[in-house]
């Protein structure tokens, strides 16, 4: 009887995945002196070991522990920027505000950003044809478990004032099912984190509503308050101007509300 490979609902492993991970590792360690000690071949071997030969619906956080160990990195715990559904602006911000960090500014986040990967049970092959979809197939897939693992660790490391950028154009500005809502919020440590400050990014040019009063933001405030962490919220009415003012804070137009 012929053996057919499981057909998953999601896209397959990103083209040139092994080469991309290795190249990104080399580039990152060249740019960040504090990570120059990292052996990128070992990082790739640990990454591969987390999912190769394993059923792609049966991946655990333990599978990624060797990779987590190799990618251990200290970022200033009071300079962490979380984000939900607004990755591009968050990354543009940390590219300008170089002393703040998103998860994708760390080695492990940088390696995996925008990539998809999975293997097959009992073979050494990477599956380039299809990978499990979180909703349609299973949640314990290699990509979802990776991001859950690194996101949890990133949130656990945060201290003092933690910022989160939220997308004010979405129906759920705060979504309990997002990585931020389901993982990061619940792994901020109340004994270390004083305040979570949300930046709600407006989409429309003429949108002058106070989105900090949105019911989902109130829900976030309630969750955070129950965890004995203070909550504050700011509207960013003009994200373009916001970025411009981060670049040039002395600009006279930057004293007004953005």
């Amino acid at each position: 009887v012929p053996r057919w490979r499981q057909q998953w609902s999601g896209p397959g492993t990103t083209k040139r995945f092994p080469e991309t991970v290795l190249a990104r590792c080399v580039k990152y360690t060249e740019i960040h002196p504090e990570m120059r000690h990292v052996d990128c071949q070992s990082v790739w071997d640990a990454f591969k070991g987390a999912f190769i030969s394993k059923h792609p619906c049966n991946i655990t956080e333990e599978d990624y522990q060797p990779l987590m160990k190799l990618g251990t990195q200290t970022v200033p715990c009071n300079k962490i920027l979380l984000w939900s559904r607004i990755k591009d602006l968050a990354h543009q911000f940390t590219q300008v505000q170089r002393d703040m960090f998103t998860l994708e500014d760390t080695l492990l986040g940088y390696l995996a950003d925008d990539l998809t990967w999975c293997g097959e049970f009992n073979t050494s092959k990477i599956n380039y044809q299809s990978c499990p979809d979180w909703r349609k197939d299973c949640s314990n897939n290699p990509v979802s478990v990776f991001w859950k693992t690194v996101s949890r660790r990133f949130a656990e490391a945060a201290c003092d004032v933690v910022h989160v950028m939220l997308n004010g154009s979405r129906s759920k500005i705060f979504d309990k099912n997002s990585t931020f809502g389901s993982v990061e919020v619940h792994n901020l440590q109340p004994e270390k984190v004083q305040t979570l400050e949300a930046w709600v990014i407006h989409g429309g040019r003429e949108d002058s509503r106070d989105l900090c009063q949105d019911p989902t933001i109130k829900e976030l405030e309630s969750i955070i308050s129950k965890r004995n962490i203070q909550f504050s919220c700011k509207n960013i009415y003009r994200p373009d101007k916001f970025l411009q003012c981060v670049k040039n804070p002395e600009d006279s137009s930057c004293t007004s509300e953005i």
Partner: antibody, heavy 122, light 110 residues
Framework: QVQLQQSGPGLVKPSQTLSLTCVIS??????????WNWIRQSPSRGLEWLGR?????????DYAVSVESRIIVNPDTSKNQFSLQLNSVTPEDTAVYYC????????????WGQGTMVTVSS | FMLTQPHSVSESPGKTVTIPCTRS????????VQWYQQRPDSSPIIVIY?????PSGVPDRFSGSIDSSSNSASLTISGLKTEDEAAYYC??????????FGGGTKLTVL
């Protein structure tokens, strides 16, 4: 039973565009698992994979490096078919052209069209 | 990468023949190998997929294997029959999922 039926001209002039169509029966071009490929075969180059189109929430195309600047593979959902367009042809493009299905559960081609001999000549 | 096959092989009916396919770069075991049979004036037919799997309808005289030490795949046909006379092509891919065929081996059943 899946079948692929090819059609298109057998003679194309140099610098013009080669156009072939492959009609699918027994499967859907919009299938979430299959991919629809074009391959050619000539004495000088043997079997050569040219490109594919496939649907996974949206349409995707992959093309061989050797032809990527000249090739378009398009699905036509209304007619359940897909097509090959190869621009700026030269006599080196003379070959038998095949359409074929990759079923998605292995890295191969399980159903092939009958092949179309295309000659590039003035 | 390239897949290299011998141009031709020949063997007598009832015997066993093995056709090798050597990968020039990249590890053969990291990517599945398929084998196709093509008789004159016909389209290719898949006889082995995923290194060693036989589609239904293909006789168990056909088998596929991988040898990591030589970075090659092989198609073995036992109990040769005259109807096995054809060209055989290996096919694999790389991390771009672009597909490559071997040059083909003409099998003559003497």
């Amino acid at each position: 039973q899946v079948q692929l039926q090819q059609s298109g001209p057998g003679l194309v002039k140099p610098s013009q565009t080669l156009s072939l169509t492959c009609v699918i029966s027994g499967d859907s071009v919009s299938s979430n698992s299959a991919a629809w490929n074009w391959i050619r075969q000539s004495p000088s180059r043997g079997l050569e994979w040219l490109g594919r189109t496939y649907y996974r929430s949206k349409w995707h195309n992959d093309y061989a490096v050797s032809v990527e600047s000249r090739i378009i593979v398009n699905p036509d959902t209304s007619k359940n078919q897909f097509s090959l367009q190869l621009n700026s042809v030269t006599p080196e493009d003379t070959a038998v052209y095949y359409c074929a299905r990759d079923p998605g559960y292995f890295y191969g081609l399980d159903v092939w069209g009958q092949g179309t001999m295309v000659t590039v000549s003035s | 990468f390239m897949l290299t096959q011998p141009h031709s092989v020949s063997e007598s009916p009832g015997k066993t023949v093995t056709i090798p396919c050597t990968r020039s770069s990249g590890t053969i075991a990291d990517y599945y190998v398929q084998w196709y049979q093509q008789r004159p004036d016909s389209s290719p037919i898949i006889v082995i997929y995923d290194d060693n799997q036989r589609p239904s309808g293909v006789p168990d005289r056909f088998s596929g294997s991988i040898d990591s030490s030589s970075n090659s795949a092989s198609l073995t046909i036992s109990g040769l029959k005259t109807e096995d006379e054809a060209a055989y092509y290996c096919q694999s891919y790389d991390s771009t999922n672009h597909w490559v065929f071997g040059g083909g081996t003409k099998l003559t059943v003497l």
